[in-house]
Interface confidence: low
Amino acid sequence: GELETSDVVTVVLGQDAKLPCFYRGDSGEQVGQVAWARVDAGEGAQELALLHSKYGLHVSPAYEGRVEQPPPPRNPLDGSVLLRNAVQADEGEYECRVSTFPAGSFQARLRLRVLVPPLPSLNPGPALEEGQGLTLAASCTAEGSPAPSVTWDTEVKGTTSSRSFKHSRSAAVTSEFHLVPSRSMNGQPLTCVVSHPGLLQDQRITHILHVSFLAEASVRGLEDQNLWHIGREGAMLKCLSEGQPPPSYNWTRLDGPLPSGVRVDGDTLGFPPLTTEHSGIYVCHVSNEFSSRDSQVTVDVLDPQEDSGKQVDLVSAS
């Protein structure tokens, strides 16, 4: 007869490992007992379990409650055992020794490999601001056995760098994603993808990029100069900008206080029925935590009685 087993059995941490050992005997041969032991190099054999044809299963104290026979129906020539809830410390060499009658004893070894799936973590880098050079956007770390693969999935242009730290029974891999921040990246997802043979599917952690910026300011509302005449109702100026964080707006008049009746509503300056008193230089001040911008316009309210044309100057400053 001969003994059938596997060279390597691979399980995921927490799963049950089947350690196979089957005696393919000639007609009439019987198995008296199967002894399982752990036989790592440099260490003495540690008994695991004994499957006896008459006495049944005995489990050594060190493995009490963790070793079972496979469920019935069982073949009397099958000496396989189940090692419940495999932990990393179970990784190593195992030996089954089969005592048969009348052929004698046979033994075979297998290696148990315990895959430790990683639990990845993503750490965002420092605050991103437009105008910075190459900056760390995020780093992603995953530790497992064997070493996991850490990659990035994103539409954002950037560079990656990885490093690995080997531990006694596992390896930690850290990958960093660097980029040159621009406003177009704002709100874009940056996903760390961790692959590992012990994972049913890749693990993904997504970080949403936040890039601080403030666009140039401009004022809308003076496109048609002829509309700005005495008596006109509903005249307004709107300050245009965008930023992250969203900016706040403030209106002032360069050549004096805002005229009475002029309403400030965030980015909009609303005028009562126009008079010549509303002529002047108005300044929109846009700011957020990142920067500030100004845009000023000259309003010249026309008197329909006069023939003179209106002049409008637009000046932007930052």
Epitope: D16, P197, Q201
Partner: antibody
Framework: EVQLVESGGGLVQPGGSLRLSCAAS????????MSWVRQAPGKGLEWVSG????????RYADSVKGRFTISRDNSKNTLYLQMNSLRAEDTAVYYC???????????????????WGQGTLVTVSS | DIQMTQSPSSLSASVGDRVTITCRAS??????LAWYQQKPGKAPKLLIY???SLQSGVPSRFSGSGSGTDFTLTISSLQPEDFATYYC?????????FGQGTKVEIK
Amino acid sequence: EVQLVESGGGLVQPGGSLRLSCAASGYSFTDYDMSWVRQAPGKGLEWVSGIKTYKSDARYADSVKGRFTISRDNSKNTLYLQMNSLRAEDTAVYYCAREYSDVVDYVSVRTPLDYWGQGTLVTVSS
Amino acid sequence: DIQMTQSPSSLSASVGDRVTITCRASQGISSYLAWYQQKPGKAPKLLIYAASSLQSGVPSRFSGSGSGTDFTLTISSLQPEDFATYYCQQHYTTPPTFGQGTKVEIK
């Protein structure tokens, strides 16, 4: 994105043959075991056949053994089911499904079916 | 072959109800058990694998428990999209076998 698309179903007379195909995309086909599962109209699910990457081990339900043959062409990322000597009781929607890549390389255990195709209807009738 | 017996075969429940479906194997299968959801005209969808592990993307209101021969699928708070037929499947041996299904209907 993992996609499985079956084709080849249709109406066939008892005793006839059909070959079902399942085109896989969105993953490394060679790394995964595959199965065929069928569902007769108004009935439950029945596993038909499976093929493993490990030793290309092919297994069959007793109800189709000797009549159906499962195979795969890894170069085309395609799974096949050759069905011969068809019977009325073979009438069903046939799904191809991917078995998730489990970590133990031995043939006695199959694994859960994590992705399924949309199914193709096989009708065996005279 | 291992026989998988599901109960009940059908049940009526309301949105928000806690629903429990049981599955019994004719022999021990450790934790080699999966649960699937199937809606009319659609392919089954994997919900639970390894008896109690939630498949990625499946809402946490679904949970599984059990080992050996007795298993349970629980929906903690039934949602409108949960009305479907549920199947258990053992994959411990070949052929893998399914339960006969449990149809969850609106009360």
